[in-house]
Amino acid sequence: LPKAPVITTPLETVDALVEEVATFMCAVESYPQPEISWTRNKILIKLFDTRYSIRENGQLLTILSVEDSDDGIYCCTANNGVGGAVESCGALQVKMKPKITRPPINVKIIEGLKAVLPCTTMGNPKPSVSWIKGDSPLRENSRIAVLESGSLRIHNVQKEDAGQYRCVAKNSLGTAYSKVVKLEVEVFARILRAPESHNVTFGSFVTLHCTATGIPVPTITWIENGNAVSSGSIQESVKDRVIDSRLQLFITKPGLYTCIATNKHGEKFSTAKAAATISIAEWSKPQKDNKGYCAQYRGEVCNAVLAKDALVFLNTSYADPEEAQELLVHTAWNELKVVSPVCRPAAEALLCNHIFQECSPGVVPTPIPICREYCLAVKELFCAKEWLVMEEKTHRGLYRSEMHLLSVPECSKLPSMHWDPTACARLPHLDYNKENLKTFPPMTSSKPSVDIPNLPSSSSSSFSVSPTYSMT
């Protein structure tokens, strides 16, 4: 008698490893013999698909080599024209040993920045990822974390983070190890010991000592009055990433000596500087009783900043005031090359008007200091970040020279415009066009960790300048 199909063994969930065989059985009783079709995720499996084998009148479906993409719901449908078609479904779960699809790579990173070592994995069950540093499992902490993706993130990279790393992916089916990669931590050049200023007699020998560190170990060069040192002998030694340089000089004239430590990070360089003055005792005696005299500015550095034929105060505590003051400006000016384009013109105006102060002629020639309000505007508006860096260096004793005592005035000690309009000098050239003034460098509440002044931020400043203010 005709009999409608009945599935006697319903399909079950099948677990299979990648590249292994997986079989679904769909036993059917019926008369006449049914026609059996198979679907995966509701899509018909074609009889001639070579990845599958269908046997026993369609009752056995075999996947010949399981792939990662084969997981899904498999259904068999039996129909013989008697009664309705019947269906049974089961799932294929593809199990997979861990596999590292994006292994970590060697990384060079600057101290203080964030490092991410990738380690993307595949596997079912999903592998857990851990990391090994050297020969020991890596412990996570507030700086070091293994991300959801398996990648290793290290915040505020420290020297001690340098070393060999590998990631380990593990699930119930096995373990995979990445190749060993190297994390190299580079450190900006930093001066540990600055050269000291000396006041000596003519013809003395003086040794200037400068010690610096960094990774890679920096090189040290010496600059005399803005040029490469032409005389004197230099001795250097390197030990434990610290370079020690000694410059021995035979003193015949006063000078400003700068120790420059430089190291390379990829295509970029980092530089640290410290300066010392060598003065000759007999030369520093003040001439007569007054401390200086008025004269027209005849130098070059401040030509564009000071008014034409400006009367400036020349300080006779220097043997050659014009040359000495020009040298101070020149050296400080060179340092301004690294500051932001917003800060630089303002700082140059401040510097020139501070070192070559306006002079009030009279029985006793008197220098006219910059007005406090102008100093504050340069300090807090134009050069907020750079000023913090300079003040920090001054406090740390990296600037021993007269140059920095002179070039960074203490605004609070300057006279106010309100006291006597003629008692202080106003700075010209504190204006900018619309393009330069999109934003000012933000005021920072803490001192920068890296002694490299930042360019103006493009985000809206935390100082009270609105990027939306109108200038018409």
């Epitope: 504050l376 100082f463 009270s464 300048v465 609105s466």
Partner: antibody, heavy 124, light 107 residues
Framework: EVQLVESGGGLVQPGGSLRLSCAAS????????IHWVRQAPGKGLEWVAS????????SYADSVKGRFTISADTSKNTAYLQMNSLRAEDTAVYYC?????????????????WGQGTLVTVSS | DIQMTQSPSSLSASVGDRVTITCRAS??????VAWYQQKPGKAPKLLIY???SLYSGVPSRFSGSRSGTDFTLTISSLQPEDFATYYC?????????FGQGTKVEIK
Amino acid sequence: EVQLVESGGGLVQPGGSLRLSCAASGFTVSSSSIHWVRQAPGKGLEWVASISSSYGSTSYADSVKGRFTISADTSKNTAYLQMNSLRAEDTAVYYCARSEGDRYVSGYSGMDYWGQGTLVTVSS
Amino acid sequence: DIQMTQSPSSLSASVGDRVTITCRASQSVSSAVAWYQQKPGKAPKLLIYSASSLYSGVPSRFSGSRSGTDFTLTISSLQPEDFATYYCQQSGVWLITFGQGTKVEIK
């Protein structure tokens, strides 16, 4: 002696216009910054607009932007506030004040001289 | 925009009292902060500029100070003529904001 004298206030209907003047003496407008500050009846001080005529730069409070225009005539040593599309909430005593220096420095020197104020009433 | 939150909004004090008025900036600002005194029907008068500098002609009992984003006006010994409303004001380049004012009344 430094002096600022405002004029031009009065009663105006909503949507109307007024032009306030601030005549300065004892200093030059070109070397200072001029500000307009208003005070609604029984309320606090509210900054309206500023001009630094040496740079020809101006700035406005959001509440008046697009409606008010600040300007200065250095030959007359006078600053102006042109007020258009006036609203009831613009009713206030309008003071002009000066501070020494350009737009960067003026904030540090404070508004040291103020006019006596002129009353603007916007009402239908 | 930067807000200057002034406190208290009013206070009662006696002659000879030490009075302190505070302004807190909503974010980091420069020292371009001034304090003014205003009496009814009169224009404001400048007392302090650059956060802590005493304006010429202002009695030395008035002083200004700064601590981070907090700016303080102190009257060391209140005098009868000091009963008035006091305002703080901060300046950007330019975005000027005033505090809401503190009225100092006789106790």
